[in-house]
Structures are given as C-alpha cells and as structure tokens.
Interface confidence: medium
C-alpha cells in the first residue's frame, strides 16, 4: 500500500470562525443549497456530526461519480480543524483504499482566513494516483469554497 | 429540458390580493433557487427575491420586503408570488427564474405572468 | 434603488461589432467573476447569453462574447445581425447591496 500526499493552501476573505461554522459543521445543508453544480445531496448514514459519523454526498448527473461516503474522522471546533476520509463510492476501489483530508482555517490578520488542505491517497498495492483525480478533487473543493464564500458574502446575517 | 411554466395572466382591481405561479420541470425542484424578477412597462429588470425550495430559505431585497410573499411547494415543484393587497403600480410583467452557479445566474426563464392591476 | 450602469441604447450596421459596457463598483463586478447577460426581445422573456463573465451556454451563438476589466463588464456581439436587435441586461453578483444587481438595460439598434 502507498500513501501520496498532496496539500494545497487557499485563501478566502471570509473570517475563519464564519467560514468553519458554514464550510464545515453546516456544509451538508449549504453545498446543495450553494452549489447545486457540484452536489445534489448530503444524508447523514449514522451518527451526529462528531468522529464516526458517516455521510453519502450525491453528485449531480453528467459528473463522473454518483457518489461518496464520508466518514468523520475529527472536529476541532477551538482550532477550526476538520479531518475526513472518502471511504466508498467515487475513485475508492479498486486501486484506491481510501482518501483522508484535513483541513485546517487559520485566520489572518486582514480579517480573512487560509484554508490548509492535505489529501492523503491512500492507493492499494503498487499502484499510484492519476494526477486527473486530484486535480477533480482540487476543483471541487475550490468550487464549493468560493460557492460558500460568495453566500456568506451576500447574505452578511448567516453564520455570524 | 429544464423548464418553469408560469400561471396566465390576471387583471385585479386595487386592494385584492392574489398569487401567481411557476411550475419547475427537468430538473430537481428543490436544490435550485428560484427568483421573482419584476418587469415594469417600458422597464428594466429588478430582482425582487429568491426561494430555495429544499427548505423555504427566502431571502427579499429590501424594496420588496413586506411587499410581496414567495413560497414553494416541493410536492407539486411550484413557487408562488403573493400580494395581500395590490395597488396599480404592481401592473408590470413578473418572470420566475431559476438560479445557476453559486448561484449567480439566472437561466431558464418562466414565460412570465401579467399582472394588471386597474379600478 | 441601486443599479449597474449601461449606455441606453447602441447602435451598428449589419456585420459590424458593437459593445455594450456594465459598470459597478468593486462590490459586484469588480469583486468577482459573476457577471451575466440576458437578451430580450420585445414580449419575450430574457434568455441568458453569457455567465461568469466570458462563459456561453451552449446553443448561444459564438458572436457573443464577455469580458471584464476592473469594474466594467463588458458585451460584445460581432457579426451584427437584424435578430440581434433587442434589449440587453447586464447583471452582477453583489456584496453589501440588495444581493441580486441588474443594469438599466441597453436598446440595441441593428441599423
């Protein structure tokens, strides 16, 4: 088994609090909402929110999975750090065991935030990831940033 | 094909109230938002507010708060435009839309519905 | 109420190229890629043209074009033709301000 490791930083204007309290803890309600694009759905399988929790997320017909399974590794809500991991459905299967995410939002001075990403795929075997999947990983996630960003931004009475 | 298909047209008298309706097809009613876009005679267009089916999150700009009501009803995929009490200054043609994107356009457009409202 | 600024009307002959400015502030068109145009013929519903600034939906003619500097948007339509005569509508994603923007609009004249 091999382990590829990819991290990405991303900066947005909105406030970390604010962005973690949209972004992350309310995401399954906000991406269809924001971002019906890129996500159709997100049901909650077992669990409430905290580690062990496990969530389907539903893509819209035309991408190329119908969808994934989430489970919820870790929710710092002091330091604004969210780990997950894709455990089935989407790229996991064959070549792919699974990925973990963390994802950390780090304010900074102007009022703003960066998000630190780290992907961790972790690949079965001798087998590698195709650089098409991160990329796709990486557009969506960017999509569903700014799809967030854009809401909080108009809409100055959520998530305060 | 993603359609809206809205309600005929009405002709009201001041002070009656009424509702309007857009019937969304071809696509799932309840992830998108869904405008209210009111077009004056001889006018442009002004966005009067937006509803997001799913769970009736409903937001007015401010010259149409307290105005006007927009609902939905995901079981029969409909939004409504309400007006407790019309005045002749409501006469204008009212399109429903669906929202795209993030959501930051909008496409398709209902037919639109015309409003006269005349003693 | 506020709205995005655009000339009243333009004008062209036929096979010549016109452009159609939208002007906002860096809460709407400067402040993100957002902005659209909707076409509008006389009685008819808007139809959508271009999206996120420079986007075309399929089935709209590549004469259309979109791009942005600063705080203006702008529309482009090449290869004037008689059916491109109608109303045009520019619109913007807005922070701060009624969140949803149209500009007055712009009556395009094919001569």
């Known amino acids: 088994m091999g382990v590829f490791n990819y991290e990405t930083e991303t900066t947005s204007v909105i406030p970390a609090a604010r962005l973690f309290k949209a972004f992350i803890l309310d995401g399954d309600n906000l991406f269809p909402k924001v971002a019906p694009q890129a996500i159709s759905s997100v049901e909650n399988i077992e669990g409430n929110g905290g580690p062990g929790t496990i969530k389907k997320i539903s893509f819209p017909e035309g991408l190329p999975f119908k969808y994934v399974k989430d489970r919820v590794d870790e929710v710092d809500h002091t330091n604004f750090k969210y780990n997950y991991s894709v455990i089935e459905g989407g790229p996991i299967g064959d070549t792919l065991e699974k990925i973990s995410n963390e994802i950390k939002i780090v304010a900074t001075p102007d009022g703003g935030s960066i998000l630190k990403i780290s992907n961790k795929y972790h690949t079965k075997g001798d087998h590698e990831v195709k650089a098409e999947q991160v990329k796709a990983s990486k557009e969506m996630g960017e999509t569903l940033l700014r799809a967030v960003e854009s809401y909080l931004l108009a809409h100055s009475d959520a998530y305060n | 094909e993603v359609q809206l298909v809205q309600s005929g047209a009405e002709v009201k008298k001041p002070g009656e109230s009424l509702r309007i309706s857009c019937q969304g097809s071809?696509?799932?009613?309840?992830?998108?938002?869904i405008a209210w876009v009111r077009q004056l005679p001889g006018k442009g267009l002004e966005s009067m507010g937006i509803i997001y089916p799913g769970d009736s999150d409903t937001r007015y700009s401010p010259s149409f708060q307290g105005q006007v009501t927009i609902s939905a009803d995901t079981s029969t995929r409909t939004a409504y435009l309400q007006w407790n009490s019309l005045k002749a200054s409501d006469t204008g043609i009212y399109y429903c839309?669906?929202?795209?994107?993030?959501?930051?356009?909008?496409?398709?457009w209902g037919q639109g519905t015309r409003v006269t409202v005349s003693s | 109420s506020y709205e995005l600024t655009q000339p009243p009307s333009v004008s062209g002959s036929p096979g010549q190229s016109v452009t159609i400015s939208c002007t906002g502030t860096?809460?709407?068109?400067?402040?993100?890629?957002?902005v659209s145009w909707y076409q509008q013929h006389p009685g008819k519903a808007p139809r959508l043209m271009i999206y996120e600034d420079t986007k075309r939906p399929s089935g709209v003619s590549h004469r259309f074009s979109g791009s942005k500097s600063g705080n203006t948007a702008s529309l482009t339509i090449s290869g004037l033709q008689a059916e491109d005569e109608a109303d045009y509508y520019c619109?913007?994603?807005?922070?701060?301000?009624?969140?949803?923007?149209f500009g007055g609009g712009t009556k395009l004249t094919v001569l």
């Open positions: 071809g696509y799932r009613f309840s992830n998108y938002w």
């Open positions: 619109y913007s994603y807005a922070t701060g301000r009624p969140s949803r923007l």
């Open positions: 839309v669906r929202l795209g994107g993030i959501p930051d356009w909008f496409d398709p």
């Open positions: 860096s809460s709407d068109v400067g402040g993100y890629n957002l």
